[in-house]
């Protein structure tokens, strides 16, 4: 299970798989969590040891039994990997005062504040962490200097105490980078830049995900199983370059290349490789061999075994072993197979334990029901219905689950709402008629309306609801991904508006959640249709030229959901429009990508 406790003045003996320098025990624990083999860690703060080489030492450990002997060591801190826990995040916004984190300093410039320095690091493709000399720093030339740093491992090469400086990490893994997301995979292409690492992968998608969570990888080349050179088949080459982009692209059949999705990793699965690979054997260190009825059962066994990283299932030969096949549970030093073989009849895959490390919003949901306007249960699991209880209980607006305590909706929904006490959020609802006196709901602790909001038509029509209790994610209630700032140029082609709103201007709230597929409209086109209004870049429009399908009264605050690369993104919030579904009058939505910083600032505030 999930073990969160830390052991003070304790050090785990033996089991070392890696060591590094980290600024504190919490960051050491996070590195352990994201390391393919680490189950336990021990950290030595500066105060705990005289040996300068070992100060801030973070020791990652593995154990066959899941535990190691603890020895007393004054000041040391030990604990467990959080691999078994839900909602793990690599995001670390902490600023470390009077610590100099050493690495390769590849850029120095003047910055007004540590925050500006951290933003610069976040928006620089190479930057892993930074050190900023404050204006109190004794060296005149060094005052206000922001040093951007990187290392092979993404962690400092040393950490030392230094007065009047602050250090911190890039916030790329917090979804705060403005760097572009290039999601395309380029067929028949080899990037001819320097390799920083290589691993075996079953396909280019897994290769891309490995690149995304590898600290030095900016782009990759994958050689498929049809690649002519046998020794290089299924080889995933992790690459970098000084410019951050490939210097040369070579046309080569049976190779595929692509880019790290580091700056948009919150809205794609990075650790979770859920596919099965048929007629494929993964080689690695064998952990166990167990009987299993199917490859799905084998994957479950691997997921439940904390040290298992991947598996190969050999189906049963006719009438053997009660129809059960052999499930080989495996691991390696880097979490990837040491070799991949084809044509031997095995079915292979990866543990789903690491899916917990990805944002829950990237989980695949039920296939969409094509046709019809009524939704089915679990089709839009992020959609909520927001009710007011004053003067009587009724549906007020839609909203979207974006975190386990957060609903994103429209600001205009709260006109005349005096207190969050009168609000109820119902999730996992298909029909309004399901809501009875005893139906469980989430109370609202706080309504956060954008402070620049005046009226829907002038923009900033966005609000957050902080729930009193947390949402347990299930198939019928789970979050939708926010778009990445690096995705501003993505052209979404599969967008849907959902809600219980009116079907025509003079109507009533619908019982069943309605859905409509609606194309996005350019802001230029939208501006032509609304000459009396200013359509800003913070708005996004959608609708058919001939009308007929649109959001309407009661849909406000609900999602404009767009599917991109198998992941649903909250592209818009239903805001305003002229009438409903009128010809040449598209619906106007709050353009969520423009508010990602605001959302994260409010939801991640300590």
């Amino acid at each position: 299970g999930c073990l969160t406790q830390l052991y003070e003045n304790a050090f785990f003996r033996g089991g070392d798989v890696a060591s590094m320098y980290t600024p504190n025990a919490q960051y050491c624990q996070m590195r352990c969590t994201f390391h393919p083999r680490c189950l336990l860690f021990s950290f030595l703060p500066a105060s705990s040891i005289n040996d300068m080489e070992k100060r801030f030492g973070c020791f990652l450990k593995d154990s066959v039994t899941g535990t190691l002997p603890k020895v007393h060591r004054t000041g040391a801190v030990s604990g467990h990997s959080l691999k078994q826990c839900h909602q793990i995040s690599a995001c670390n916004k902490d600023i470390y005062v009077d610590l100099d984190m050493k690495g390769i300093n590849y850029n120095s410039s003047v910055a007004k504040s540590a925050q500006e320095c951290q933003e610069r690091c976040t928006d620089d493709v190479h930057c892993h962490f930074f050190t900023y000399a404050t204006r109190q720093f004794p060296s005149l030339e060094h005052r206000n200097i922001c040093l951007l740093k990187h290392t092979q491992t993404g962690t400092p090469t040393r950490i030392t105490k230094l007065d009047k400086v602050v250090s911190g990490f890039s916030l790329k893994s917090c979804a705060l980078s403005n760097l572009a997301c290039i999601r395309d995979i380029f067929p028949n292409t080899v990037f001819a830049d320097s390799n920083i690492d290589s691993v075996m992968a079953p396909d280019a998608f897994v290769c891309g995900r490995i690149c995304t969570h590898h600290p030095g990888c900016l782009f990759f080349t994958f050689f498929s199983q049809e690649w002519p050179k046998e020794s290089q088949r299924n080889l995933c080459l992790l690459k970098t370059s000084e410019s951050g982009l490939p210097s040369t692209r070579i046309k080569k059949s049976k190779a595929l290349s692509g880019f790290s999705l580091q700056s948009c990793r919150h809205s794609i699965p990075v650790f979770c490789h859920s596919s099965f690979y048929h007629d494929t054997d993964f080689l690695g260190e064998e952990l166990d061999i167990v009987a299993a009825k199917s490859h799905e059962a084998c994957q479950k066994l691997c997921t439940n075994a904390v040290r298992c990283q991947f598996f190969t299932y050999t189906p049963a030969q006719a009438s053997c072993n009660e129809g059960k096949g052999k499930c080989y549970l495996k691991l390696s030093s880097n979490g990837s197979p040491t070799k991949i073989l084809h044509g031997r009849g095995g079915i292979s895959g990866y543990t789903l334990r690491l899916c917990k490390m990805d944002n829950e919003c990237t989980t695949k949901i039920k296939p969409r029901i094509v046709g019809g306007t009524a939704s089915v249960r679990g089709e839009w699991p992020w959609q909520v219905t927001l009710h007011t209880t004053s003067p009587t209980q009724r549906h007020l607006c839609g909203g979207s689950i974006i975190g386990n305590q957060w609903i994103l909706t429209a600001a205009h929904c709260f006109y005349g709402v005096e207190s969050p006490k009168i609000l109820r959020v119902y999730s996992g609802i298909l029909n309004q008629s399901e809501i009875k006196e005893d139906t469980s709901f989430f109370g609202v602790q706080e309504i956060i309306i954008h402070d620049q909001y005046k009226m829907a038509e002038s923009g900033y029509d966005i609000a957050l609801l902080k729930l009193e209790t947390t949402v347990n994610y299930t198939d019928s209630q789970r979050p939708i991904c926010l778009p990445s700032k690096g995705d501003r140029n993505v052209i979404y082609t599969d967008c849907w508006v959902t809600g219980w709103g009116y079907r025509k201007l003079r109507d009533k709230i619908q019982n069943t959640l309605q859905k409509a597929k609606i194309p996005l409209v350019t802001n230029e086109e939208c501006q032509k249709r609304y000459r009396g209004h200013k359509i800003t870049h913070k708005m996004i429009c959608a609708g058919y030229r001939e009308g007929g399908k649109d959001a309407c009264k009661g849909d406000s605050g609900g999602p404009l959901s767009c599917k991109h690369n198998e992941v649903w993104h909250l592209v818009g919030i239903t805001s305003w429009g002229e009438g409903c579904a009128q010809r040449e009058r598209p619906g106007v939505y709050t353009n969520v990508v423009e508010y990602v910083d605001w959302i994260l600032e409010k939801t991640q505030a300590v």
Epitope: D100, K102, N105, S108, V110, P138, S139, L140, E141, H142, N144, I145, L147, T160, L162
Partner: antibody
Framework: QVQLVESGGGVVQPGRSLRLSCAAS????????MHWVRQAPGKGLEWVAI?????????YYADSVKGRFTISRDNSRDMLYLQMNSLRAEDTAVYYC?????????????WGQGTLVTVSS | DIQMTQSPSSLSASVGDRVTITCRAS??????LNWYQQKPGKAPKLLIY???SLQSGVPSRFSGSGSGTDFTLTISSLQPEDFATYYC??????????FGQGTRLEIK
């Protein structure tokens, strides 16, 4: 490649003035802090003045020259200057202009070949 | 102002020798120490920055160590071109930048 070329040195009487120039090339001059450092004959190095790149008012001087010397720069021409007034015999030295680079810590990573200033009656 | 004291002021050594020059700061300067080499009639040249980092293009026989107040420059195997004057310099508490008085390395 980075080049710094000083000029303007010579023999001058005590109390008189002299203006040294340093022509920079091979780097983005406006982005870097620039220094003057001097070395009296047979002696060690003595720092004279700095002009910070990011703040036009940030000029700092060694106590020994404060009030007499003025450092200035012309970013449009990639030039650094040292205006030396009320010169004294102890100002006799080779004057170097040097580019500063933050290589983890501030360093003087490139120096000119120097120009000799002799203050003598 | 921080004072920098080098020792020895001068030393004689032979080609192939291992040579160590020390530099002491009057107060802690962390690792904000640089070493320069100067040959007669030439400008100084940066050898080591941040106490122990080798400037690009400088031979690996040069190394630096230390932190706080005590620092050393080591030449592992003296070459004929290494005979010069060496200066340490602090850039921790500035202005002013201060240099050591220099160490003259001569052929024995």
């Amino acid at each position: 490649q980075v080049q710094l070329v000083e000029s303007g040195g010579g023999v001058v009487q005590p109390g008189r003035s002299l203006r040294l120039s340093c022509a920079a090339s091979g780097f983005t001059f406006s982005s870097y802090n620039m220094h003057w450092v001097r070395q009296a004959p047979g002696k060690g190095l003595e720092w004279v003045a700095i002009f910070l790149s990011y703040d036009g008012s940030n000029k700092y001087y060694a106590d020994s020259v404060k009030g007499r010397f003025t450092i200035s720069r012309d970013n449009s021409r990639d030039m650094l200057y040292l205006q030396m007034n009320s010169l004294r015999a102890e100002d006799t030295a080779v004057y170097y202009c040097a580019k500063s680079e933050i290589l983890v810590v501030p360093t003087l990573d490139y120096w000119g070949q120097g120009t000799l200033v002799t203050v003598s009656s | 102002d921080i004072q920098m004291t080098q020792s020895p002021s001068s030393l004689s050594a032979s080609v192939g020798d291992r040579v160590t020059i020390t530099c002491r700061a009057s107060q802690s300067i962390s690792s904000y120490l640089n070493w320069y080499q100067q040959k007669p009639g030439k400008a100084p040249k940066l050898l080591i920055y941040a106490a122990s980092s080798l400037q690009s293009g400088v031979p690996s026989r040069f190394s630096g160590s230390g932190s706080g107040t005590d620092f050393t420059l080591t030449i592992s195997s003296l070459q004929p071109e290494d005979f010069a004057t060496y200066y340490c310099q602090q850039s921790y508490s500035t202005p002013p930048i201060t240099f050591g008085q220099g160490t003259r390395l001569e052929i024995k």
